[in-house]
Each structure stands twice: as C-alpha cells, then as structure tokens.
C-alpha cells in the first residue's frame, strides 16, 4: 500500500513540477526591471526566454519576439536548451510513469516491468528537474552579473551632462516558478525511484536443499549462489534460482506482500 501511495504521490508531484517547468519556460517575466532606487518611469520592462515586453502606465503592453537565433547570447540559448530538454524528458517520464502506475492494469504486465518503468520515469524526472534548476540558475547568475554592470551611464549632451537611465533587471517571477517546479520534479523523481524498490518482486525464499547425486554433492542456496565448489560432470539437476526468473515448472506467480490494489 505504501509503495502505491509513494508511486502515486511521486507521479502527482512530478506532474505539478513539469507543468510548472512548462509554465516557467513560457512566462515572459524571467527578468523584470529593477524599480528600487530608480527614477519613477512610466514604463515597466520585463523579459522572457522568447520575447521582451514593455508595459506602459497607459495600460498598453507591447511584446517583441526575439526573431533571431544567431544574434542571441549563448547563455540564453543554453537556458532555452536546458528548459526544453527538461520539458521533453519530463513529458516522456510522465508517459512512462502512467503505464508504470501500480493502480493501472495493462494486460499482463509483470511487476518487474512496472518496477523498471517506474525507475526509468523516476530517473527522467530527476534529470528533468535538474535541467530546469540548472537553466533557471544559469539565467539568475547572468542577471546578477549584468545587474552590477548596468550602473547609470552619463552621456554628454548639448549644454552639459545629461543623465540617461540605464534599465537594470532583477529576478522575475518565472525564476521562482522554475526553481520550485524543478525542485518538485526532482522530489517526484526521487519518490518514483523509492517506489521502484518496493515494486521489484521479492526473491522467493527457497530453503537450502541437498541433492544427493551419484557424483559430487552440491548444496544450493537461494539467490543463485553455489555453496559448493565441486564441479562434476553430472550437472543435469543443477538448478540455479534467480530472483526474477521463472522456470517452466513455476508458471504460477506467487503473490508478494505488495500486491494489494
């Protein structure tokens, strides 16, 4: 029961996280005009990964897309790439995890397959979350660097010094959405990986049996480990039990303690 809850919660948390990563990637407010210690301007500037916007006090908002690839800073391209990779991995992870959910029955899918799918989706969520966190952090670092470089410049105009206001940018809402979303996706991924351990079918505990063959005596222990070192020619009855494998004479599946729906 706990495994199903952990898996379900991991899925929901990851789903919220990936929705947040998508939202953050699409948001225009990655960087917003710093209003602290600034002359009061009637124009508010903010920028996203795909376009920059200006909101005027009149209520009019104008957004312009970055209609160039080569002209954009490499860091911005890197952030875009990280966010997109995060979304793609997260989306694939969600797709995989849906089929891996314990509460969903698909044909005669075995627990081992569900466990593997849960682990795969968990890893995908972790990488997706890390991509988002990395992308947002790279952008934040870029902002901090630019902030201190963007001090007010002085231009010499006709009749003396004329000050121009250099727009400085600070952290926008999208950064916080991205950090939280990335964190949630990461947590969801970890939960899926934890759930995977509980989903993996337990090894059947076979009692140690001594086979008294005409040749060397070989004792067999569970887990496929041969206790004896005697290698004789008579090996027809030497059966090694593997935790996940099933032999012909074990076609019926044994319920594990986690097989409650």
């Amino acid at each position: 029961m706990a495994v199903t809850a952990c898996q379900g919660l991991g899925f929901v948390v990851s789903l919220i996280g990936i929705a947040g990563i998508i939202a953050a990637t699409c948001m225009d407010q990655w960087s917003t005009q710093d209003l602290y210690n600034n002359p009061v301007t009637a124009v508010f500037n903010y920028q996203g990964l795909w376009r920059s916007c200006v909101r005027e006090s009149s209520g009019f908002t104008e957004c312009r897309g970055y209609f160039t690839l080569l002209g954009l800073p490499a860091m911005l391209q890197a952030v875009r790439a990280l966010m997109i990779v995060g979304i793609v991995l997260g989306a694939i992870g969600l797709l995989v995890s849906i089929f891996a959910l314990k509460c969903i029955r698909i044909g005669s899918m075995e627990d081992s397959a569900k466990a593997n799918m849960t682990l795969t989706s968990g890893i995908m969520f972790i990488v997706s979350g890390l991509c988002a966190i990395a992308g947002v952090s790279v952008f934040a670092n870029m902002l901090v660097t630019n902030f201190w470089m963007s001090t007010a410049n002085m231009y010499t105009g006709m009749g003396g010094m004329v000050q121009t206001v250099q727009t400085r940018y600070t952290f926008g809402a999208a950064l916080f959405v991205g950090w939280v979303a990335g964190g949630l996706t990461l947590i969801g991924g970890v939960m899926m990986c934890i759930a995977c351990r509980g989903l993996a079918p337990e090894e059947t505990n076979y009692k140690a049996v001594s086979y008294h063959a005409s040749g060397h005596s070989v004792a067999y222990k569970p887990g496929g480990f041969k206790a004896s070192t005697g290698f004789g020619s008579n090996t027809k009855n030497k059966k090694i039990y593997d935790g996940g494998a099933r032999t012909e004479d074990e076609v019926q599946s044994y319920p594990s303690k986690h097989d409650y729906v």
Partner: antibody
Framework: EVQLVESGGGLVKPGGSLRLSCAAS????????MSWVRQAPGKGLESVST????????YYPDSVRGRFTISRDIAKNSLYLQMNSLRAEDTAVYYC???????????WGQGTLVTVSS | DIVMTQSPDSLAVSLGERATINCKSS????????????LTWYQQKPGQPPKLLIY???TRESGVPDRFSGSGSGTDFTLTISSLQAEDVAVYYC?????????FGQGTKLEIK
C-alpha cells in the same frame, strides 16, 4: 466611441476644496491610464495627476502633491480629482484625458473651469 | 521633475513652407527595453483641448496628415510640418511620457508669415 465629460468646476475661495468628476464611456475604464491636465488662462499645459492602467498607481507633480488626490470608481466609470487647500495659482481649465500608446493622451474631455478667488 | 524646453517660443512661417519646432528634455526619454522614445507632440487651437499628433517621438496618430513628422532620440526631438497649411496655426506642445510626473514643454506658437 470614447467620450470624456468633466464636471464639478466652479468658483472657490483660497484654502477651499473642490471635487472634479470625469464620466468616461466607450472603453474598458479600468484598463487604461487616466490623467488630469490643467491649463491656466493664457498659459501652457500642466499634468497635475496620473493614475496608471490596471494597477492604478497614482502620481503627482510637486506643485500639487499632498493637496490633490486622483481616484477612480470602476463601477461608475468615473475619474475624480479631489482638490484641497486650493490656491489662486490653481485657477485653470482642468481636462480629463485617457492615455494609450507611448503613454500619450489621444482622448480629451472639453474641460471644466476652476476659479480660485476671494 | 523632468524639464522640457521648446524652441522657439513662437514661429512665423509662410504657407507651403517648412516649419520646424524643437524640444529638449533634461533626461533621455529612450527606453532601452523597446528602443522607443517616450515623447509626444500635441497641437492646440484656441478654445479646444489639445490634439495628439505624434507619439513615441515619430509615430503619427491615425488621422493626422502626413505633412506632420517627428524625429529625434534621447534628449533632442523635432516636430516638422513639411508644407504649412492655414489650419496648422496653433500652439504646439511636446510632452515627456517616460518619467513621472509627465511634463510639457512651454509651447511654441505657430503663425503664418
């Protein structure tokens, strides 16, 4: 069609108060920035207060700050200018104007005259 | 507050001739976010409210004749009437729309010579 009609002007004694109203129609009132602009007889234009679109922040020049208050009633589609501690130099035609692109003022009312005199 | 200075205070131009009015601001009105200059030009005739001519320093308002044009960037701006018509006699004002409070120039009175 955008329409702005000012009212509330008149004669008032120095130190007195007056409340100007501007009835707006033909647009979504809360979405646009609005301004009160005055013009003293034979003089130039002076912006006395601005309320921004959406967030409704208010701004005043030093000449009226602390004495004038701009506000709006979205339900009534009305803009107001509360003028206290009036002085002789506040005598002017007061225009209500709606802003748009570039914070410019494409729409103006016909104005209302405020006379401050003893 | 931002100081807007217009020159000349008055201008007399012959019909069909070019009229040029200048406006200078004490601070740059250029917004780096969209590379637009927040300067507006108005025309006011006696007994009427002002009429918007140009916004963003060079964008003509719809319905304004194309003989009116605006130019300039940063702190120096110009309104040009390419061929003066009788109906263009008025007072012209520039306005800072970038910094609060929005301030107007003192006005330039345009007359026919």
């Amino acid at each position: 069609e955008v329409q702005l009609v000012e009212s509330g002007g008149g004669l008032v004694k120095p130190g007195g108060s007056l409340r100007l109203s501007c009835a707006a129609s033909g647009f979504t009132f809360s979405s646009y920035g609005m301004s009160w602009v005055r013009q003293a007889p034979g003089k130039g234009l002076e912006s006395v207060s601005t309320i921004s679109g959406g967030d409704s922040y208010t701004y005043y020049p030093d000449s009226v700050r602390g004495r004038f208050t701009i506000s709006r009633d979205i339900a009534k589609n009305s803009l107001y200018l509360q003028m206290n501690s009036l002085r002789a130099e506040d005598t002017a035609v007061y225009y209500c104007a709606r802003s748009y692109n570039g914070n410019s003022l494409p729409y103006w009312g016909q104005g209302t005259l405020v006379t401050v005199s003893s | 507050d931002i100081v807007m200075t217009q020159s000349p205070d008055s201008l007399a131009v012959s019909l069909g001739e070019r009229a040029t009015i200048n406006c200078k601001s004490s601070q740059s009105l250029l917004n780096s976010g969209n590379q637009r200059n927040y300067l507006t030009w108005y025309q006011q005739k006696p007994g009427q409210p002002p009429k918007l001519l140009i916004y963003w320093a060079s964008t003509r308002e719809s319905g304004v004749p194309d003989r009116f044009s605006g130019s300039g960037s940063g702190t120096d701006f110009t309104l040009t009437i390419s061929s003066l018509q009788a109906e263009d006699v008025a007072v012209y004002y520039c306005q800072n729309n970038y910094f609060y409070p929005f301030t107007f120039g003192q006005g330039t009175k345009l007359e026919i010579k």
